[in-house]
Amino acid sequence: QLPPGKPEIFKCRSPNKETFTCWWRPGTDGGLPTNYSLTYHREGETLMHECPDYITGGPNSCHFGKQYTSMWRTYIMMVNATNQMGSSFSDELYVDVTYIVQPDPPLELAVEVKQPEDRKPYLWIKWSPPTLIDLKTGWFTLLYEIRLKPEKAAEWEIHFAGQQTEFKILSLHPGQKYLVQVRCKPDHGYWSAWSPATFIQIPSDFTMNDEQKLISEEDLGGEQKLISEEDLHHHHHH
């Protein structure tokens, strides 16, 4: 029977800069029941605080609700593991909420084949930002990435959409059923999970041009940019 091994705080994430959760990995338990507690203080402060909520984030977690989350402070935290034989402490982790944001996936993904009479057909993809994110405050800039592939293909084709919430793709294989997904990330932070896949059947008469893809950028006032396959790959493939 031994004191517990050193725990490790391995991840902290916030969905929207308003709340956040940190998770730790226990060390060895020393063969005894072990209690874990997370304590923290904020930069410039010596008042030590205890984790306000060990439940919401699941096992080995600490959740900081809205009233405990301050965007303008660095949190300095550590986990204490204690059993009958003694204690051990994790290394201190410095957490700035601004840099740990991982949003929920974008919502309301809609995909449509557009076949205007006067120009080439295209795939139109549209989505909404995740509900927890308030873009109006200006605290957030969300960037989006789209991936799509024929249903039976192994490789995804990835497009970076910038801040726009709609996107047009010209080059597709006629007669194929495509899967389309979108994800987002804040300017500082982590990519969300991919949204649930939306399926779209591309008509057999969908004409395509292997050389070019057509991308419409809302923030260019609806102007359309022709981007060569090479440029697209170079600038937008991740």
Partner: antibody, heavy 118, light 107 residues
Framework: EVQLVESGGDLVQPGESLRLSCTAS????????MNWVRQAPGKGLEWVSY????????YYVDSVKGRFTISRDNAKKSLYLQMNSLRADDTALYYC???????????WGQGTMVTVSS | DIQMTQSPSSLSASVGDRVTITCRAS??????LAWFQQKPGKVPELLIS???TLQSGVPSRFSGSGSGTYFTLTISSLQPEDIATYYC?????????FGGGTKVEIK
């Protein structure tokens, strides 16, 4: 409604003891750090003591260290201040105050009066 | 311990006047500073936290500024209901010290 109600104030003689209580309602008491703050008649506010949400961490102002003990019973949603060896300069209105998540006193009780006099 | 010095200790001003109260910390406290208002016979109420964040429900004529060791509370246009004693308080470490208070009266 979020509320803190203090009780236990009394007139006592120097050297005697007194126990103050504060009962919370309308919020999840065991998630909040709590404090006692006092105000002598006609004087300013003086922070007395702090206790963390589980009771594991406690702080005191120097003038009461060794004489006062803060404690809490989360099951009863109650905060306590055990005051021993009371002195005349402990005479004050004692407030119980909640510390919000970013360390500010956001909710105060109405106070309970402690008078130490011979 | 860090001392909090408030000035003036009292002031008298006319309705509509701009009133400024200052609070100095004996050491750097970043912006871990709160302002409270205590009306006669009443419980203190939180006006401002983090030196400049106005609490919800507090009139916009109140504002706070400062960082480090020097802080101010400003009432842009004094109203009769603002008669009270105002306290600054630091909250970055124990003891959670209050300033001595500033009593505001109407001329």
């Amino acid at each position: 409604e979020v509320q803190l109600v203090e009780s236990g104030g009394d007139l006592v003689q120097p050297g005697e003891s007194l126990r103050l209580s504060c009962t919370a309602s309308g919020f999840t008491f065991n998630s909040y750090e709590m404090n006692w703050v006092r105000q002598a008649p006609g004087k300013g506010l003086e922070w007395v003591s702090y206790i963390s949400s589980s009771g594991g961490t406690k702080y005191y102002v120097d003038s009461v260290k060794g004489r006062f003990t803060i404690s809490r019973d989360n099951a009863k949603k109650s905060l306590y201040l055990q005051m021993n060896s009371l002195r005349a300069d402990d005479t004050a209105l004692y407030y119980c105050a909640r510390l919000n998540g970013v360390d500010v006193f956001d909710i105060w009780g109405q106070g309970t009066m402690v008078t130490v006099s011979s | 311990d860090i001392q909090m010095t408030q000035s003036p200790s009292s002031l008298s001003a006319s309705v509509g006047d701009r009133v400024t109260i200052t609070c100095r910390a004996s050491q750097d406290i970043f912006n871990y500073l709160a302002w409270f208002q205590q009306k006669p016979g009443k419980v203190p109420e939180l006006l401002i936290s983090a030196a400049s964040t106005l609490q919800s429900g507090v009139p916009s004529r109140f504002s706070g500024s400062g960082s480090g060791t020097y802080f101010t509370l400003t009432i842009s246009s004094l109203q009769p209901e603002d008669i009270a004693t105002y306290y600054c308080q630091r909250y970055n470490s124990a003891p959670l010290t209050f300033g001595g208070g500033t009593k505001v009266e109407i001329k």
